[in-house]
């Protein structure tokens, strides 16, 4: 059996070397001479020769200083043989523990640590954490037991101890009130890490703390009184620019200004914020009326996009806005005038009077009337009174100029102000119908096939309105009934069916068709009928010799 006591060896020993560690014994040495040897890391494998053993005595020796931070434990095997070289013992594992010396100082993980904290943060607010490491043994010794301290703070304002550091964790916290970004936006701390619980080796690093902005400063008007002027009736006109200062961080919601007009119930003004310089741009939201009010005194308040973090006074400004008088156009009353008149209204008679009012009550002005648009040239106006008369016959069925029985004319009124101003009124003449149109057929050109012809539907059109329209009466005249027949196609008699009585020669025919409306107004229309060399339904076919009264006349 082996006799091996526990083995430990301090690192960094002085010498002289080799130095005895322990004597190894085998019980077999009573039976004869025993020879000792060792194998393993530090003996016969790298690092080779750190440990040796005296062959005959069994003394285990170290040959050089050890470094725990490089190798903390060596595992060797001891061997015992007799003089003839036979093993007298099984190999035995030997553990050599290198004991620690405080030969490493702490090291910070960064040279500079960065953190941030909101201004106004209360004591106890965590800011950041610094971390250091130590290579020494932190299990069996205090050689790696690090303690953190703050060595200095720059600036030392408003207090030299604004922050504290947890000795054990390295967490930096606020310890004193009074952090103010606008006064001291950054702090630089020199922090120390020392082993042996602060009594041993030490090192330093820098912690840079940025104080972040909160909305603890209001925007303030400078100046607080303004003057501006604006012409009446004009919207979106810039009146003046309002100036503010805000100590908070530029181009942040805590700096950006929001303007509110406190006494603009009518919503006549608006203040927008210039995003570049935070100015307030006061403009008209709608046209102002000089005749109604000549001056406005506005009270404008300014706040930020985000609420104030602390109780702050809201800054206000006073703006005096003078409204400038402008010559305004006369206004027709009503702007659109509807007048009902029969389409057979007498030429030269007065239809209506259409006048305008002068908005410029502070000026004595004369109004002159003119017709601006009268596409059919039916009207004339008295320039002084606005009386409108007919100069030509009206026609409800003039569909180029009349839409839905309504003729639209534009009348203008011009004052004698400086500069001259002109207003426009719309005159709607609602033309009532008279029975001045006889019915007409549509189409007037018809095609039939000579063989197996398909009857053709002819629509009856009357430009008038009921009761001057359907039911219509149709009749073939001038001998057309010899070759052709008609019958009504629908109960309202608004269309007829035309067909030949017998086979007709290919060629062109003229059929006289008399159409009469419900009020007995009639008209004879000539239908142009072509009989084509085809069967069934006719397309368009070539023109042949004309035929009078539905009877073909030889050439």
């Amino acid at each position: 059996d082996w006799v091996i006591p526990p083995i430990s060896c301090p690192e960094n020993e002085k010498g002289p070397f080799p130095k005895n560690l322990v004597q190894i014994k085998s019980n077999k040495d009573k039976e004869g001479k025993v020879f000792y040897s060792i194998t393993g890391q530090g003996a016969d494998t790298p690092p080779v020769g750190v440990f040796i053993i005296e062959r005959e005595t069994g003394w285990l020796k170290v040959t050089e200083p050890l470094d725990r931070e490089r190798i903390a434990t060596y595992t060797l095997f001891s061997h015992a043989v007799s003089s003839n070289g036979n093993a007298v013992e099984d190999p035995m594992e030997i553990l050599i523990t290198v004991t620690d010396q405080n030969d490493n100082k702490p090291e910070f993980t960064q040279e500079v640590f960065k953190g941030s904290v909101m201004e106004g943060a209360l004591p106890g607010t965590s800011v950041m954490e610094v971390t250091a490491t130590d290579a020494d043994d932190d299990v069996n010794t205090y050689n790696a037991a690090i303690a953190y301290t703050i060595l200095s703070q720059d600036p030392e304002l408003p207090d030299k101890n604004m922050f504290t550091i947890n000795r054990n964790t390295g967490v930096i916290s606020v310890v004193t009130t009074g952090l103010d970004r606008e006064s001291f936006p950054t702090y630089t701390l020199v922090v120390q890490a020392a082993d042996l619980q602060g009594e041993g080796l030490s090192t330093t690093a820098t912690a840079v703390i940025t104080v972040t902005d909160t909305n603890d400063n209001p925007p303030i008007f400078n100046p607080t009184t303004y003057k501006g002027q604006v012409p009446e009736n004009e919207a979106n006109v810039v009146i003046t620019t309002l100036k503010v200062t805000d100590a908070d961080a530029p181009n942040t919601p805590a700096w950006e200004a929001v303007y509110t007009i406190l006494n603009d119930d009518g919503g006549q003004f608006v203040v927008t914020t210039n995003p570049v310089n935070n100015d307030g741009i006061l403009k008209t939201a709608k046209g102002l009326d000089f005749e109604a009010k000549q001056q406005y005194i506005l009270h404008v308040a300014v706040t930020n996009v985000v609420p104030f973090e602390v109780s702050l006074t809201t800054s206000t400004a006073t703006v005096t806005v003078d409204v400038l008088d402008v010559n305004e156009a006369p206004i027709f009353v009503p702007p659109e005038k509807r007048v009902e008149v029969s389409e057979d209204f007498g030429v030269g008679q007065e239809i209506t009077s259409y006048t305008a009012q002068e908005p410029d009550t502070f000026m004595e002005q004369k109004i002159t009337y003119r017709i601006w648009r009268d596409t059919a040239n039916w009207l004339e106006i008295n320039p002084d009174t606005g009386a409108i008369s007919t100069r030509a016959e009206l026609d409800r069925e003039d569909f180029e100029h009349v839409k839905n029985s309504t003729y639209t004319a534009l009348i203008i009124a011009t004052d004698n102000g400086s500069p001259v101003a002109t207003g426009t009124g719309t005159l709607l003449l609602i033309l009532s119908d008279v029975n001045d149109n006889a019915p007409i057929p549509e189409p007037r050109t018809i095609f039939f096939c000579e063989r197996n012809p398909k009857p053709q539907v002819i629509n009856i059109i009357d430009a008038d309105l009921p009761p001057n329209t359907s039911p219509f009466t149709a009749e073939l005249t001038h001998g057309a009934s010899a070759n052709w027949t008609i019958q009504y196609n629908d109960p309202t008699q608004e269309s007829i069916i035309l067909k030949p009585k017998m086979a007709l020669e290919v060629g062109d025919y003229k059929i006289n068709l008399k159409l009469m409306d419900n009020q007995n107004k009639d008209q004879v229309t000539t239908l142009e009928v072509s009989v084509c060399d085809c069967e069934g339904a006719a397309g368009v076919c070539r023109k042949a010799q004309p035929v009078e009264a539905g009877l073909q006349i030889p050439a």
Epitope: E450, R451, M502, A503, E505
Partner: antibody, heavy 120, light 106 residues
Framework: EVQLQQSGPDLVKPGTSVKISCKAS????????IHWVKQSHGKSLEWIGR????????TYNQKFKDKAILTVDKSSSTAYMDLRSLTSEDSAVYYC?????????????WGQGTLVTVSA | QIVLSQSPAILSASPGEKVTMTCRAS?????IHWYQQKAGSSPTSWIY???NLASGVPTRFSGSGSGTSYSLTVNRVEAEDAATYYC?????????FGGGTRLEIK
């Protein structure tokens, strides 16, 4: 009932002429066209032309305009077809026909046919 | 002029069979009219305006088509249907007839 009665068969010499008749009955003779159709032996039908008893107008198939002359005798309600300058090619059965209506493009009523044989 | 081509030239069928004969026009026509002609007799109007049966024609006959393609169909052929059938157009002058289809009953 509408009837078209044609004249009997004819055997004629080449170069001569023949006149075929078609007597209409059972309707107003002037109200409808009379058409003439040729059918060569074992062959199809060919339209020769038509005559309008209403206005004495004729319409011919270009192929037969120098071969046939169409006439009518309104007093006897009879239609005639003269065939001239006969050759063996003219040997055929010739039919007169009319439509149900004056403007029909098809032929509802047919005569019994007249066989014309051209032979030396 | 419009040329009408009929096919087949001869059509042979047993009683009760369904048969169809066609008529093709060299250009589009509005209608086709059909005639039946038995040996030694005049033609008889059979179908007019493409699909209308003439008076007395059995309902087993029908006509259809448009443009340039038309047909006559006999649903269940009978011995009395043996004849030559001609198609005819008059969409343009002169009216023309097809060459005929001879229907034989076995």
């Amino acid at each position: 009932e509408v009837q078209l009665q044609q004249s009997g068969p004819d055997l004629v010499k080449p170069g001569t002429s023949v006149k075929i008749s078609c007597k209409a009955s059972g309707y107003s003779f002037t109200a409808c066209y009379i058409h003439w159709v040729k059918q060569s032996h074992g062959k199809s039908l060919e339209w020769i032309g038509r005559f309008s008893p209403n206005n004495d107008r004729t319409t011919y198939n270009q192929k037969f305009k120098d071969k046939a002359i169409l006439t009518v005798d309104k007093s006897s309600s009879t239609a005639y077809m003269d065939l001239r300058s006969l050759t063996s090619e003219d040997s055929a059965v010739y039919y007169c026909a009319r439509g149900e209506e004056s403007w029909d493009a098809w032929f509802t009523y047919w005569g019994q046919g007249t066989l014309v044989t051209v032979s030396a | 002029q419009i040329v009408l081509s009929q096919s087949p030239a001869i059509l042979s069928a047993s009683p009760g069979e369904k048969v169809t004969m066609t008529c093709r026009a060299s250009s589009s026509v509005s209608y086709i009219h059909w005639y039946q002609q038995k040996a030694g007799s005049s033609p008889t109007s059979w179908i007019y305006a493409t699909s209308n049966l003439a008076s007395g024609v059995p309902t087993r006959f029908s006509g259809s088509g448009s443009g340039t393609s038309y047909s006559l169909t006999v649903n269940r052929v009978e011995a009395e249907d043996a004849a030559t059938y001609y198609c005819q157009q008059w969409s343009t002058t002169p009216p023309t007839f097809g060459g005929g289809t001879r229907l034989e009953i076995k």
